[in-house]
Amino acid sequence: ESLGTEQRVVGRVAEVSGPEPSQQEQLVFGSGDAVELSCPPPGGGPMGPTVWVKDGAGLVPSERVLVGPQRLQVLNASHEDSGAYSCRQRLTQLVLCHFSVRVTDAPSSGDDEDGEDEAEDTGVDTGAPYWTRPERMDKKLLAVPAANTVRFRCPAAGNPTPSISWLKNGKEFRGEHRIGGIKLRHQQWSLVMESVVPSDRGNYTCVVENKFGSIRQTYTLDVLERSPHRPILQAGLPANQTAVLGSDVEFHCKVYSDAQPHIQWLKHVEVNGSKVGPDGTPYVTVLKTAGANTTDKELEVLSLHNVTFEDAGEYTCLAGNSIGFSHHSAWLVVLPAEEELVEADEAGSVYAG
């Protein structure tokens, strides 16, 4: 990320280690509803013996809790039935499906399609605090260059409305604890620190509580000290591409720079049959450069639509800052549309329109 951009933690999508929990769902039920969770066997094969688990503990079947190998039913659900449910293989304890279930005190109502009903929804959730968008609370670690603005967010709800407070390394965190202070936006459940410095490194915990309970989330902040170097470009990007005539192609270039980088995309051209000028500098045309509303992220991608044979050739991502320049190049090969493409070379990708 470039200097001065705001780093937002909550909800920035993070890689999850281990098997991809593609079956994970976040579900909301009303009080009194029947919670029904189904977990079909992966790949349609035999299921084998399974066990249903809530918040780490095995579920005991009862008149209200009906447990089957592929399905779990919790009848007449209440707030206490909220939690993390998973279906696991009994022998290996491998998680087959995972569900985050929230039971609200408001019974789930039919959809008001045309929005005519202006009556207040009196079924406000009561009880202990909960994250209002739990699927966004998935990033725990943030590394940012010094001088950036950092925002931590922990949107929550409960009844009564919970309070939010912040800890740094387990201790109460207040504005006077850092030069430049902090901005606490309680309505937005956020903590903002501008122009972070290495001493801001640490664990930041939001504590959300009311009389019914408390929830907390901890984020680790690492502040990267400024190092005077030219931009670093991620190895292997942009990658060589092989494309079919008329298809779309994207080149990607990942730029790492403390000082604000300036990114350009260039295409190498020939002038009077020569690829380089008298001084050995290549002839290029600028395809993309920073504009008034262009973000660094947008500049890291070069999109070519409906490619022609004239688009074939060498493309360069050029990044510069106050210290110097770096560049990586890649080639685009354009093939006739009638050719059946099976695979590209090791470095390239195939786009078939």
Epitope: V13, E25, Q26, R133, D138, P155, A157
Partner: antibody, heavy 118, light 107 residues
Framework: EVQLQQSGPDLVKPGASVKISCKAS????????MNWVKQSHGKSLEWIGD????????TYNQKFKDKATLTVDKSSSTAYMELRSLTSEDSAVYYC???????????WGQGTTLTVSS | DIVMTQSHKFMSTSVGDRVSITCKAS??????VAWYQQKPGQSPQLLIY???TRHTGVPDRFTGSGSGTDYILTIRSVQAEDLALYYC?????????FGAGTKLELK
């Protein structure tokens, strides 16, 4: 520039299934969640659910959990929504829209018109 | 689910007027409200999020305000290109929900 390109209009019979695609370009697809929204003719917008392109984790509006399945193919930067057991009530324009953090849907696809009719 | 109510289905205005579109949530949404503009045959476009933060490239004649359950989108000096449908959305809690929309039209 950021673009979300959706598949074209579709006419399907009741009881059938359909899969709508949304190809993202101009940004790193794993940096944003992908949301899906339904707009019935002359009516408001309804949120169907979202998917985290990094790991495939989905969140559904309870109303659509038995109707829609969201998936993503990271390699082609394409999100998909499959709608099953279609009825005339499912005739609508469906949009994909990206979101970072909790900050609203900043870019939308052009919409896919689905007509369910025998 | 949180219900977002836009009490006016239509609002009449003239070019140059100041207009305020209101939206009421059925419960406190902690300023987690976005506003979208939709023109006929087009996709919605984000104007405002977190009640008052203007999205990149949105003209400064559009401002958002409000807290708790009551939110307002104000267009300071209406231009012809602002005649459109406006939706509020709460992006605070899942399931995310939208208002029914307010159509801004010429007097």
């Amino acid at each position: 520039e950021v673009q979300l390109q959706q598949s074209g209009p579709d006419l399907v019979k009741p009881g059938a299934s359909v899969k709508i695609s949304c190809k993202a370009s101009g940004y790193t697809v794993t940096d944003y969640y992908m949301n899906w929204v339904k707009q019935s003719h002359g009516k408001s917008l309804e949120w169907i659910g979202d998917i985290n392109p990094n790991n495939g984790v989905t969140t559904y509006n309870q109303k659509f959990k038995d109707k829609a399945t969201l998936t993503v193919d990271k390699s082609s930067s394409t999100a998909y929504m499959e709608l099953r057991s279609l009825t005339s009530e499912d005739s609508a324009v469906y949009y994909c829209a990206r979101e970072e953090d909790f900050d609203g849907f900043d870019y939308w696809g052009q919409g896919t018109t689905l007509t369910v009719s025998s | 689910d949180i219900v977002m109510t836009q009490s006016h289905k239509f609002m009449s205005t003239s070019v140059g007027d100041r207009v305020s579109i209101t939206c009421k949530a059925s419960q406190d949404v902690s300023t987690g409200v976005a506003w979208y503009q939709q023109k006929p045959g087009q996709s919605p476009q984000l104007l405002i999020y977190w009640a008052s933060t203007r999205h990149t490239g949105v003209p400064d004649r559009f401002t958002g305000s409000g807290s708790g359950t009551d939110y307002i989108l104000t267009i300071r000096s209406v231009q012809a290109e602002d005649l459109a449908l406006y939706y509020c959305q709460q992006h605070y809690s899942t399931p995310l929900t939208f208002g029914a929309g307010t159509k801004l039209e010429l007097k």
